[in-house]
Interface confidence: low
């Protein structure tokens, strides 16, 4: 990996640890978020039986959670670095409204929910630094997001619990797919 501007590879104090490359930094950030999601899922699963529920499809119809598809260029077959990076950033931007929804959904893991939200923002910024084609990235409409948030918060308790479970599961899957794809870049 190239040495960052203003840096010289001989300047490191401990030869066994070079500065993290951009890719390593992103990799670490995703793993940190995945750790946070695991903690949140633990609370969700302990609190309700949503994790074993077979009625996920009922709630999933109300959500439009980002998913990786073949056309996004993130899978090994048909891998396309630029298309995939745009999809990852766009997907993360779309997840932000759902992460906002999660903020009041946890009791013992409130701090963890905040950490997942904030570190996702940081991850987006790292990825934007990496992206060459920022124009291709569509930012979600704030008005649409606001009304979606209101709609989600107006659901009954069962649907709110299910929505929380689905957001965490989908976000985990999206990040895991992103992690695999980014390791090819």
């Amino acid at each position: 990996a190239p040495v960052p501007p203003g840096e010289d590879s001989k300047d490191v104090a401990a030869p066994h640890r070079q500065p993290l490359t951009s890719s390593e930094r992103i990799d670490k950030q995703i793993r940190y978020i995945l750790d946070g999601i695991s903690a949140l899922r633990k609370e969700t699963c302990n609190k309700s039986n949503m994790c074993e529920s077979s009625k996920e499809a009922l709630a999933e119809n109300n959500l439009n959670l980002p998913k990786m598809a073949e056309k996004d260029g993130c899978f090994q077959s048909g891998f396309n670095e630029e298309t995939c990076l745009v999809k990852i950033i766009t997907g993360l931007l779309e997840f932000e409204v759902y992460l906002e929804y999660l903020q009041n959904r946890f009791e013992s893991s409130e701090e963890q929910a905040r950490a997942v939200q904030m570190s996702t923002k940081v991850l987006i910024q790292f990825l934007q630094k990496k992206a060459k084609n920022l124009d291709a990235i569509t930012t979600p409409d704030p008005t649409t997001n606001a009304s979606l948030l209101t709609k989600l918060q107006a659901q009954n308790q069962w649907l709110q619990d299910m929505t929380t479970h689905l957001i965490l599961r989908s976000f985990k899957e999206f990040l895991q797919s992103s992690l695999r794809a980014l390791r090819q870049m």
């Epitope: 960052p4 203003g6 840096e7 104090a13 993290l20 920022l134």
Partner: antibody
Framework: QVQLQQSGAELAKPGASVKMSCKAS????????MHWIKQRPGQGLEWIGY????????EFNQKFNDKATLTADRSSSTAYMQLNSLTSEDSAVYYC????????????WGQGTTLTVSS | SIVMTQTPKFLLVSAGDRVTITCKAS??????VAWYQQKPGQSPKLLIY???NRYSGVPDRFTGSGNGTDFTFTISTVQAEDLAVYFC?????????FGGGTKLEIK
């Protein structure tokens, strides 16, 4: 070489607003995030937030959400921070600092702008 | 927010001494820690980043180490020009927080 030139000292009354500037030179302004940091006399450093000059996206320490507004003018390579509803607690030196390439460390700092809030 | 507890607050040393400053994070920050030097009347300067990496042009008497929550900054042989306040900072997660600072004075 990289330089961040900040605007001069400000004297403001409680309740007023101030806007300070940070002019960047010696590097591509839009490539690096710009952080703002507060330092009260004889005290430590407090991270306020940063702006991505390329997109205008900014993120804040929650404590400063309603206090600070960050903007950037790409044509003049200048970052701005506006502080509103000033109180004596806002009296401090404010630094702009360039985000390092490899993380959210600040590798180049401006000389600081001293803000004094007094009636 | 992650709290960075820095000790000691003051250090009075002689030129040639070895100096150690510690910073304890309230939760793991991996190795996303930096150390800054602020000389009287000046802006802070980045010395160490990612826990143990010296920034370009920083003398090798300055070193950093750590283990996720406990971080150490060392000046192997203090020189007169090292008179300054030293700060640690975590950038593991926002808001990025600084330690309270250590004022180094030379006898």
């Amino acid at each position: 070489q990289v330089q961040l030139q900040q605007s001069g000292a400000e004297l403001a009354k409680p309740g007023a607003s101030v806007k300070m500037s940070c002019k960047a030179s010696g590097y591509t302004f839009t490539t690096y995030w710009m952080h703002w940091i507060k330092q009260r006399p004889g005290q430590g450093l407090e991270w306020i937030g940063y702006i991505n000059p390329s997109t205008g996206y900014s993120e804040f320490n929650q404590k400063f959400n309603d206090k600070a507004t960050l903007t950037a003018d790409r044509s003049s390579s200048t970052a701005y921070m506006q502080l509103n509803s000033l109180t004596s607690e806002d009296s401090a030196v404010y630094y702009c600092a360039r985000d390092a390439y490899y993380g959210n460390y600040e590798d180049y700092w401006g000389q600081g702008t001293t803000l004094t809030v007094s009636s | 927010s992650i709290v960075m507890t820095q000790t000691p607050k003051f250090l009075l040393v002689s030129a040639g001494d070895r100096v150690t400053i510690t910073c304890k994070a309230s939760q793991s920050v991996s190795y996303d820690v930096a150390w800054y030097q602020q000389k009287p009347g000046q802006s802070p300067k980045l010395l160490i980043y990612y826990e143990s990496n010296r920034y370009s042009g920083v003398p090798d008497r300055f070193t950093g180490s750590g283990n996720g929550t406990d971080f150490t900054f060392t000046i192997s042989t203090v020189q007169a020009e090292d008179l300054a306040v030293y700060f640690c900072q975590q950038v593991y997660t926002s808001p990025y927080t600084f330690g309270g600072g250590t004022k180094l004075e030379i006898k």
